[in-house]
Interface confidence: low
């Protein structure tokens, strides 16, 4: 808390300008009117204040707006944003995408801080959902943003927003997140033709069920091995050798290099060896000829 002292004669600030950098902390407190500061916030960013001086300016704004800053001030906070705590930010009502962009710009290049996470939360909550424009903005600043959300939060992303998602935005998503995103993507891209649809849906296929993979295998999509390796193991296991061959097309030869890794390893164990032999890749570990194949999933369901 800065002690209240009278402003020395002739030092009362008429505007926010460079001369203030020579003010001591107590002089800033005594000589800068909070209302003036609020109306000229856009100038603060251009002036090389020390962190201690910024603390004083923040204190003045806090006194002027104890219930939270208005958006007109928030939009021009600039580096003063870095001084805000999550508790400060929770008092704000940020509705403008421009305000969000301005503050994210301040934090650009750094990983998401608790302040930024709180700001985004306030913004998204105010909008009611994670719309396309917001998602565009957030993933531009934080490519991993989407995968930082829990499956719970992803459930409130509308399918229309999926158009804003780039493949790299999904790099760090885990299977549970893709389980939520895949049905939304399927809905978002449902009116596209086969090859265009596959290009768009490919990044989301880690959440696809078996029946959708079977359908894709009938469409000459030539899925690459990197995509295949990200598929859900439980979705891949029921696929036949013929279906996997159709799904991968010319990329089927890559199965040999991945035969010790999931989901390929587990899928091989479920296939008849003579079916695997038809691929001519030397895949080993299938069920020998003459062995009875029990459907264990059906057995579990009945027990």
């Amino acid at each position: 808390e800065v002690e209240k002292t009278a402003c020395p004669s002739g030092k009362k600030a008429r505007e926010i300008d460079e001369s203030l950098i020579f003010y001591k902390k107590w002089e800033l407190e005594a000589c800068v009117d909070a209302a003036l500061l609020a109306t000229q916030m856009d100038r603060v960013n251009a002036i090389p204040f020390t962190y201690e001086q910024l603390d004083v300016l923040k204190h003045k704004l806090d006194e002027l707006y104890p219930q939270g800053y208005p958006e007109s001030v928030i939009q021009h906070l600039g580096y003063l944003f870095l001084k805000m705590s999550p508790e400060d930010i929770r008092k704000w009502n940020v509705t403008s995408l421009e305000t969000l962009k301005a503050l994210l710009e301040v934090n650009k290049g750094h990983e998401m801080s608790p302040q930024v996470a709180t700001l985004i939360d306030r913004f998204v909550k105010g909008r009611g959902q994670l719309d396309k424009d917001t998602l565009d903005t957030l993933t531009a600043f934080y490519p991993g943003y989407l995968c930082s959300l829990s499956p719970e939060e992803l459930s409130s992303v509308p399918p229309s927003s999926i158009w804003a998602v780039r493949p790299q935005d999904l790099d760090t998503c885990d299977p549970r997140q893709l389980d939520v995103l895949y049905p939304k993507a399927r809905l978002a891209f449902q009116n596209m033709n086969g090859s265009e649809y596959f290009v768009k849906i490919q990044s989301f296929l880690g959440g696809a069920p078996t029946e959708d993979l079977k359908a894709l295998s009938q469409q000459n999509v030539s899925m690459d091995l990197a995509t295949f390796m990200k598929l859900r193991t439980d979705a891949v296991l029921p696929l036949t050798v013929a279906e996997v061959q159709k799904l991968l097309g010319p990329h089927v030869e890559g199965l040999k290099a991945e035969e010790r890794h999931r989901p390929v390893r587990d899928w091989i164990l479920r296939q008849r060896q003579d079916d695997l032999d038809t691929l001519g890749l030397g895949l080993q570990g299938g069920i020998p000829n003459g062995y009875l194949v029990l459907d264990l999933s059906m057995q579990e369901a009945l027990s």
Partner: antibody, heavy 121, light 107 residues
Framework: EVQLVESGGGLVKPGGSLRLSCAAS????????MSWVRQAPGKGLEWVGR??????????DYAAPVKGRFTISRDDSKNTLYLQMNSLKTEDTAVYYC????????????WGQGTLVTVSS | DIQMTQSPSSLSASVGDRVTITCRAS??????LNWYQQKPGKAPKLLIY???SLQSGVPSRFSGSGSGTDFTLTISSLQPEDFATYYC?????????FGGGTKVEIK
Amino acid sequence: EVQLVESGGGLVKPGGSLRLSCAASGFTFSNAWMSWVRQAPGKGLEWVGRIKSKTDGGTTDYAAPVKGRFTISRDDSKNTLYLQMNSLKTEDTAVYYCTTDLPKLRNFHIWGQGTLVTVSS
Amino acid sequence: DIQMTQSPSSLSASVGDRVTITCRASQSISSYLNWYQQKPGKAPKLLIYAASSLQSGVPSRFSGSGSGTDFTLTISSLQPEDFATYYCQQSYSTPLTFGGGTKVEIK
């Protein structure tokens, strides 16, 4: 002052029903995601279920042991949360807490004082 | 469902001691991990959210760390009012689940 006050607990026979209420004050109830958490005597905490705000769809989720027997509802005009408990079992005996969820982090940051439900013949 | 395993289930410590409680999730939950303190006959109180963020009003001797599957709650210098039971809770996906609790007792 931010406050949650539960009521409606008591003694009930196995197979019986009970409705708990939770009166909220001091915050915008309509925006809050509300949960019920319970604690059996001498045991740990167990999440019962949750209802989202109307703006987030107002949907409900339940823990497996209570699914199909318990129903969570809300009346935003009365700032009140409800837990309708049917087909009660002895293992439902617990202190039931009403809590709010912070939407971003799904953590419970306001709790009521709890109300005891005893299921016994 | 995601299982949360807390250890130890109880511990004895003296005032001034540094206390560490661990919590392990059965699968990755990123940073969606919260810590609560509960005293007998009282409702739980949120201490730490998002694995490491201190809830407003909670003393700075409490801190949280970890990400993925392994998390830690540390009390840097145990005070008399800290003797209580501590719970971790994952908020990654429903059903939301709690650890079994760690009772911190006076040695």
